[in-house]
């Protein structure tokens, strides 16, 4: 019962986590910036992984996607990749974990198969969560170290000049959503891995071999060293020596903590 609860809870926590990772990836508020501020009008810029938005104090908002892949910082591309890998792994993990749930019966699936699937999905959730946490952390590091902050560069041309403006970006809501979601996915994955141990069947699939002391197999006869060791002729036609090795199928032995390797 505890195993089923752990597995079910792990699935639900991971599901919420992956939904959060998807939400964070799609959100525009990865970084927010107070660009222009005076008593009459205020214009704010916030940027996500896919597009940049500007919003007026009146609430009017306009968003546009980034022009090209080539003009974007490599770090942004890396964050995109990490988040997408996290989503894909998480989605596959969810699919696998649905079939692995103990409360769902599919044909004659054995517990060992369910245990393996639970472990697989658990590992996928852990990696998915780590990808999301890594992606968000890389982006946050870019903000903290002012990765894209350039000094006030001037470009002069036929039509006047263009000046880059030194700006300050702060953490957007998507970063916090991503961190929490990644953490939840990670926790869900750990819970699935813990549940896997409980799902593993009691008996092992291979034949365990137990070794017993075999003192009766050597018959000592007084009067010289004439002992029947089982290697010579067996006149009485009975099994004298069997090497002391017996499989569990051949002999009934009481369970012992030393029986199984």
């Amino acid at each position: 019962m505890a195993v089923t609860a752990c597995q079910g809870l792990g699935f639900v926590v991971s599901l919420i986590g992956i939904a959060g990772i998807i939400a964070a990836t799609c959100m525009d508020q990865w970084s927010t910036q107070d660009l222009y501020n005076n008593p009459v009008t205020a214009v704010f810029n916030y940027q996500g992984l896919w597009r940049s938005c500007v919003r007026e104090s009146s609430g009017f908002t306009e968003c546009r996607g980034y022009f090209t892949l080539l003009g974007l910082p490599a770090m942004l591309q890396a964050v995109r990749a990490l988040m997408i890998v996290g989503i894909v792994l998480g989605a596959i993990g969810l699919l696998v974990s649905i079939f692995a749930l103990k409360c769902i019966r599919i044909g004659s699936m054995e517990d060992s198969a369910k245990a393996n699937m639970t472990l697989t999905s658990g590992i996928m959730f852990i990696v998915s969560g780590l990808c999301a946490i890594a992606g968000v952390s890389v982006f946050a590091n870019m903000l903290v170290t002012n990765f894209w902050m350039s000094t006030a560069n001037m470009y002069t041309g036929m039509g006047g000049m263009v000046q880059t403006v030194q700006t300050r970006y702060t953490f957007g809501a998507a970063l916090f959503v991503g961190w929490v979601a990644g953490g939840l996915t990670l926790i869900g994955g750990v819970m699935m891995c813990i549940a896997c141990r409980g799902l593993a069947p009691e008996e092992t699939n291979y034949k365990a071999v137990s070794y017993h002391a075999s003192g009766h197999s050597v018959a000592y006869k007084p009067g010289g060293f004439k002992a029947s060791t089982g290697f010579g002729s067996n006149t009485k036609n009975k099994k004298i020596y069997d090497g002391g090795a017996r499989t569990e199928d051949e002999v009934q032995s009481y369970p012992s903590k030393h029986d199984y390797v």
Epitope: L35, Y36, N45, E56, E62
Partner: nanobody, 120 residues
Framework: QVQLVESGGGLVQPGGSLRLSCAAS????????TGWYRQAPGKQRDLVAT???????NYADAVKGRFTISRDNAKNTVYLQMNNLEPEDTAVYFC?????FGFGDRRVAWDQGTQVTVSS
Amino acid sequence: QVQLVESGGGLVQPGGSLRLSCAASGSILNLMTTGWYRQAPGKQRDLVATITFGGTTNYADAVKGRFTISRDNAKNTVYLQMNNLEPEDTAVYFCYLDYIFGFGDRRVAWDQGTQVTVSS
């Protein structure tokens, strides 16, 4: 690279009108604000009027009620209609564009300015 081309300046009598226009060309991801500054001889550059991407306008106290800023999104052009001009309005008028060029890249483009002279 964004380029601004301004037109409409010239000599006008007091009480007269002029219409300045500023056309922008080039790659702009997000437009923030656009508008005009002016610089009279021997003085610093002062804000005249601005208009945000959403159409919110802002005017310097000295020109309120006389100047009107507007824009044409289709033509990427901003206009400054100047009515009831006074000799104090004589200055070089600079058009500017505050915009987002790319990811985390905010820029301000300026034109070379156009002379407006109010004299009888």
